[in-house]
Protein backbone atom coordinates (compact mmCIF):
# COMPACT_ATOMS: atom_id res chain seq x y z
CA UNK A 1 0.00 0.00 0.00
CA UNK A 2 1.25 3.69 -1.18
CA UNK A 3 2.65 5.51 1.81
CA UNK A 4 0.40 8.65 2.91
CA UNK A 5 3.36 9.98 5.18
CA UNK A 6 6.96 10.29 5.31
CA UNK A 7 9.61 10.31 7.24
CA UNK A 8 11.55 13.80 8.10
CA UNK A 9 13.81 14.99 5.38
CA UNK A 10 11.44 12.80 2.78
CA UNK A 11 8.69 14.30 0.72
CA UNK A 12 5.63 12.77 -0.92
CA UNK A 13 5.33 12.79 -4.53
CA UNK A 14 3.52 10.07 -7.46
CA UNK A 15 2.93 7.85 -3.75
CA UNK A 16 6.15 7.56 -3.06
CA UNK A 17 8.69 8.81 -0.38
CA UNK A 18 11.49 11.01 -1.52
CA UNK A 19 14.88 12.70 0.21
CA UNK A 20 14.94 16.24 0.22
CA UNK A 21 17.65 18.15 -1.05
CA UNK A 22 19.91 18.59 1.39
CA UNK A 23 20.43 23.13 2.36
CA UNK A 24 22.81 24.15 -0.14
CA UNK A 25 21.32 22.01 -2.93
CA UNK A 26 18.17 22.02 -5.71
CA UNK A 27 16.22 19.34 -6.40
CA UNK A 28 16.86 18.44 -10.57
CA UNK A 29 14.43 15.55 -10.82
CA UNK A 30 12.39 13.58 -8.23
CA UNK A 31 13.41 10.03 -6.85
CA UNK A 32 11.51 7.25 -8.87
CA UNK A 33 11.13 3.04 -7.77
CA UNK A 34 14.73 2.58 -9.17
CA UNK A 35 15.88 6.05 -8.79
CA UNK A 36 17.28 8.61 -5.63
CA UNK A 37 16.21 12.34 -5.21
CA UNK A 38 18.87 13.81 -7.90
CA UNK A 39 19.70 17.53 -6.45
CA UNK A 40 22.30 20.07 -7.81
CA UNK A 41 24.94 22.47 -5.47
CA UNK A 42 23.68 25.95 -5.49
CA UNK A 43 25.43 27.96 -7.64
CA UNK A 44 27.70 30.95 -6.81
CA UNK A 45 25.96 33.79 -4.87
CA UNK A 46 23.16 31.64 -4.77
CA UNK A 47 22.10 29.42 -1.75
CA UNK A 48 19.15 27.19 0.16
CA UNK A 49 19.29 27.14 3.95
CA UNK A 50 16.52 24.46 4.54
CA UNK A 51 16.43 20.66 3.51
CA UNK A 52 14.29 21.69 0.57
CA UNK A 53 12.63 20.11 -3.27
CA UNK A 54 13.10 23.81 -4.86
CA UNK A 55 13.85 23.53 -8.16
CA UNK A 56 15.47 27.10 -7.80
CA UNK A 57 17.89 28.40 -5.53
CA UNK A 58 17.61 31.74 -3.91
CA UNK A 59 19.97 34.80 -4.56
CA UNK A 60 22.15 36.30 -1.85
CA UNK A 61 21.01 39.49 -0.54
CA UNK A 62 22.34 42.40 -2.44
CA UNK A 63 24.13 44.73 0.07
CA UNK A 64 23.72 47.92 -1.42
CA UNK A 65 26.47 50.81 -1.10
CA UNK A 66 24.06 53.75 -2.14
CA UNK A 67 22.18 52.55 0.59
CA UNK A 68 24.61 52.89 3.21
CA UNK A 69 24.98 48.64 3.12
CA UNK A 70 28.16 46.76 3.37
CA UNK A 71 28.62 42.93 3.87
CA UNK A 72 29.18 41.87 7.27
CA UNK A 73 29.21 38.35 6.63
CA UNK A 74 29.49 36.56 3.12
CA UNK A 75 26.67 34.12 2.16
CA UNK A 76 27.51 30.40 1.58
CA UNK A 77 25.53 28.07 -0.24
CA UNK A 78 23.50 27.57 2.83
CA UNK A 79 23.29 31.02 4.38
CA UNK A 80 21.66 34.18 2.80
CA UNK A 81 24.58 37.19 2.88
CA UNK A 82 24.09 39.45 6.12
CA UNK A 83 24.47 42.95 5.34
CA UNK A 84 25.20 45.95 8.11
CA UNK A 85 25.50 49.72 7.82
CA UNK A 86 28.42 51.61 6.93
CA UNK A 87 30.22 52.86 10.32
CA UNK A 88 28.05 55.30 12.08
CA UNK A 89 24.46 54.15 10.20
CA UNK A 90 22.24 52.29 11.98
CA UNK A 91 19.54 49.72 10.32
CA UNK A 92 16.07 50.15 10.28
CA UNK A 93 15.19 46.96 10.42
CA UNK A 94 16.77 43.49 12.08
CA UNK A 95 16.59 42.67 8.09
CA UNK A 96 18.81 45.86 7.38
CA UNK A 97 17.78 46.57 3.95
CA UNK A 98 18.51 50.46 4.69
CA UNK A 99 20.69 52.67 6.48
CA UNK A 100 19.60 56.00 8.97
CA UNK A 101 21.64 57.79 10.94
CA UNK A 102 19.54 57.33 13.46
CA UNK A 103 16.00 57.07 14.80
CA UNK A 104 13.81 59.36 16.07
CA UNK A 105 11.30 58.74 19.17
CA UNK A 106 7.65 59.24 18.89
CA UNK A 107 5.25 61.81 20.44
CA UNK A 108 4.87 59.87 23.98
CA UNK A 109 8.56 59.11 24.59
CA UNK A 110 11.33 60.89 25.14
CA UNK A 111 15.05 60.43 24.31
CA UNK A 112 17.01 58.32 27.06
CA UNK A 113 19.86 58.34 25.38
CA UNK A 114 21.25 60.45 22.05
CA UNK A 115 22.56 58.16 19.38
CA UNK A 116 26.31 57.43 18.50
CA UNK A 117 28.45 55.97 16.32
CA UNK A 118 27.85 52.54 17.48
CA UNK A 119 24.29 52.88 19.10
CA UNK A 120 21.07 54.06 17.76
CA UNK A 121 18.64 56.79 19.80
CA UNK A 122 17.52 54.95 22.92
CA UNK A 123 14.17 55.85 23.52
CA UNK A 124 12.11 55.57 26.86
CA UNK A 125 8.03 56.20 27.37
CA UNK A 126 7.55 59.07 29.43
CA UNK A 127 6.03 58.53 32.68
CA UNK A 128 2.86 60.38 34.75
CA UNK A 129 4.00 64.31 34.99
CA UNK A 130 5.92 64.38 31.92
CA UNK A 131 5.33 64.92 28.09
CA UNK A 132 6.57 64.53 24.87
CA UNK A 133 4.43 65.69 21.35
CA UNK A 134 6.99 65.66 18.77
CA UNK A 135 8.94 63.46 17.02
CA UNK A 136 12.94 63.73 17.94
CA UNK A 137 15.92 62.57 18.01
CA UNK A 138 17.34 64.66 20.60
CA UNK A 139 14.01 65.91 23.25
CA UNK A 140 13.49 64.66 26.28
CA UNK A 141 9.96 64.29 28.23
CA UNK A 142 9.19 67.55 29.42
CA UNK A 143 7.16 67.83 32.61
CA UNK A 144 3.42 68.84 32.77
CA UNK A 145 3.03 72.65 33.07
CA UNK A 146 2.69 73.42 37.23
CA UNK A 147 -0.74 75.24 36.95
CA UNK A 148 -0.46 75.95 41.08
CA UNK A 149 3.07 78.05 40.53
CA UNK A 150 0.80 80.16 38.08
CA UNK A 151 -1.70 80.88 40.15
CA UNK A 152 -4.03 78.68 37.94
CA UNK A 153 -5.87 75.51 38.16
CA UNK A 154 -5.87 72.18 35.92
CA UNK A 155 -8.48 72.33 33.14
CA UNK A 156 -7.41 69.46 31.34
CA UNK A 157 -5.59 66.75 32.22
CA UNK A 158 -1.90 66.34 30.56
CA UNK A 159 -1.44 62.61 29.11
CA UNK A 160 2.51 61.31 27.52
CA UNK A 161 1.41 63.44 24.64
CA UNK A 162 0.02 66.68 25.49
CA UNK A 163 0.61 69.34 28.42
CA UNK A 164 -2.12 70.04 30.95
CA UNK A 165 -4.29 73.14 30.23
CA UNK A 166 -4.62 75.42 33.07
CA UNK A 167 -6.81 78.05 33.43
CA UNK A 168 -8.40 80.55 36.01
CA UNK A 169 -9.47 79.52 38.96
CA UNK A 170 -13.13 80.22 39.79
CA UNK A 171 -13.38 83.19 42.42
CA UNK A 172 -15.92 82.86 44.64
CA UNK A 173 -17.87 85.89 44.67
CA UNK B 1 13.02 65.98 -4.25
CA UNK B 2 14.78 66.96 -0.96
CA UNK B 3 17.86 68.75 -0.96
CA UNK B 4 20.26 70.26 1.38
CA UNK B 5 23.33 72.27 0.55
CA UNK B 6 26.09 73.68 2.72
CA UNK B 7 28.18 76.27 2.34
CA UNK B 8 30.75 78.29 4.69
CA UNK B 9 33.32 76.19 5.55
CA UNK B 10 37.43 76.65 4.39
CA UNK B 11 40.56 76.95 5.80
CA UNK B 12 40.81 79.30 9.71
CA UNK B 13 43.59 79.18 12.25
CA UNK B 14 43.01 78.11 15.78
CA UNK B 15 40.90 80.18 17.68
CA UNK B 16 38.88 81.60 14.49
CA UNK B 17 35.39 81.48 14.14
CA UNK B 18 33.16 80.72 11.07
CA UNK B 19 29.90 80.21 10.15
CA UNK B 20 28.23 77.79 8.27
CA UNK B 21 24.82 77.42 6.12
CA UNK B 22 22.43 74.69 4.68
CA UNK B 23 20.22 75.55 2.46
CA UNK B 24 16.91 73.91 2.71
CA UNK B 25 14.41 72.51 -0.05
CA UNK B 26 12.08 70.46 -1.72
CA UNK B 27 10.32 69.97 1.94
CA UNK B 28 8.24 72.20 4.80
CA UNK B 29 11.56 73.29 6.75
CA UNK B 30 9.74 74.77 9.15
CA UNK B 31 8.41 71.22 10.32
CA UNK B 32 11.32 69.77 10.99
CA UNK B 33 14.16 69.19 13.47
CA UNK B 34 17.41 69.61 11.86
CA UNK B 35 21.06 68.12 12.90
CA UNK B 36 24.47 68.85 11.92
CA UNK B 37 26.68 65.84 11.50
CA UNK B 38 30.37 65.74 10.74
CA UNK B 39 32.68 63.56 9.58
CA UNK B 40 36.81 63.62 10.11
CA UNK B 41 39.10 61.96 7.79
CA UNK B 42 39.19 58.10 8.09
CA UNK B 43 37.05 59.09 11.47
CA UNK B 44 33.41 57.66 12.80
CA UNK B 45 30.52 60.67 11.64
CA UNK B 46 29.44 62.72 15.08
CA UNK B 47 26.51 64.14 15.44
CA UNK B 48 27.57 67.74 16.57
CA UNK B 49 23.72 69.26 17.37
CA UNK B 50 20.44 70.18 16.77
CA UNK B 51 17.41 72.24 16.61
CA UNK B 52 13.72 71.49 17.10
CA UNK B 53 11.45 72.92 14.62
CA UNK B 54 10.37 76.46 15.88
CA UNK B 55 14.27 76.77 16.85
CA UNK B 56 13.57 76.68 20.65
CA UNK B 57 15.55 73.95 21.70
CA UNK B 58 18.75 72.64 20.80
CA UNK B 59 21.38 70.21 21.24
CA UNK B 60 25.26 70.56 21.59
CA UNK B 61 28.08 67.31 21.46
CA UNK B 62 29.64 68.11 24.67
CA UNK B 63 33.08 68.66 22.17
CA UNK B 64 31.08 71.69 21.02
CA UNK B 65 29.37 72.85 24.40
CA UNK B 66 30.35 76.89 24.92
CA UNK B 67 31.94 77.03 21.11
CA UNK B 68 28.85 76.05 18.97
CA UNK B 69 25.83 77.74 18.73
CA UNK B 70 22.88 76.13 16.05
CA UNK B 71 20.42 78.20 14.75
CA UNK B 72 18.04 78.65 11.65
CA UNK B 73 15.47 80.74 9.60
CA UNK B 74 12.33 79.02 8.55
CA UNK B 75 11.44 82.22 6.69
CA UNK B 76 14.61 81.75 4.45
CA UNK B 77 14.55 77.51 4.75
CA UNK B 78 17.98 77.77 5.93
CA UNK B 79 20.59 76.41 9.01
CA UNK B 80 23.15 77.66 10.68
CA UNK B 81 26.29 76.66 12.98
CA UNK B 82 28.17 79.66 14.21
CA UNK B 83 31.49 78.16 15.36
CA UNK B 84 33.93 80.07 17.64
CA UNK B 85 37.21 79.22 19.47
CA UNK B 86 37.80 76.35 16.46
CA UNK B 87 40.48 73.94 17.12
CA UNK B 88 41.83 71.50 15.18
CA UNK B 89 40.17 68.72 15.82
CA UNK B 90 37.25 70.52 14.70
CA UNK B 91 38.65 70.11 11.41
CA UNK B 92 35.59 67.89 9.57
CA UNK B 93 33.38 67.66 6.31
CA UNK B 94 30.18 69.07 8.01
CA UNK B 95 26.75 68.06 6.50
CA UNK B 96 23.18 69.30 7.98
CA UNK B 97 20.73 66.19 7.88
CA UNK B 98 16.27 65.79 8.31
CA UNK B 99 14.44 63.52 9.42
CA UNK B 100 14.00 60.30 8.51
CA UNK B 101 18.02 60.51 8.39
CA UNK B 102 18.17 58.27 5.63
CA UNK B 103 21.46 57.60 4.20
CA UNK B 104 22.26 59.45 1.07
CA UNK B 105 19.58 62.20 2.00
CA UNK B 106 21.82 64.73 2.96
CA UNK B 107 24.16 67.51 1.15
CA UNK B 108 27.75 66.88 -0.21
CA UNK B 109 29.02 68.73 3.27
CA UNK B 110 31.32 71.76 3.58
CA UNK B 111 35.26 71.02 4.57
CA UNK B 112 36.64 73.06 7.51
CA UNK B 113 40.00 72.86 8.12
CA UNK B 114 41.63 74.10 10.86
CA UNK B 115 45.23 74.66 10.97
CA UNK B 116 47.50 77.41 11.33
Known amino acids: EPPTACREKQYLINSQCCSLCQPGQKLVSDCTEFTETECLPCGESEFLDTWNRETHCHQHKYCDPNLGLRVQQKGTSETDTICTCEEGWHCTSEACESCVLHRSCSPGFGVKQIATGVSDTICEPCPVGFFSNVSSAFEKCHPWTSCETKDLVVQQAGTNKTDVVCGPQDRLR | EVQLLESGGGLVQPGGSLRLSCAAS???????EMWWVRQAPGKGLERVS?????????YYADSVKGRFTISRDNSKNTLYLQMNSLRAEDTSVYHC?????????WGPGTLVTVSS
Open chain 2, 97 to 105: AKPPFIFGD
Open chain 2, 26 to 32: GFTFRDY
Open chain 2, 50 to 58: AINPQGTRT
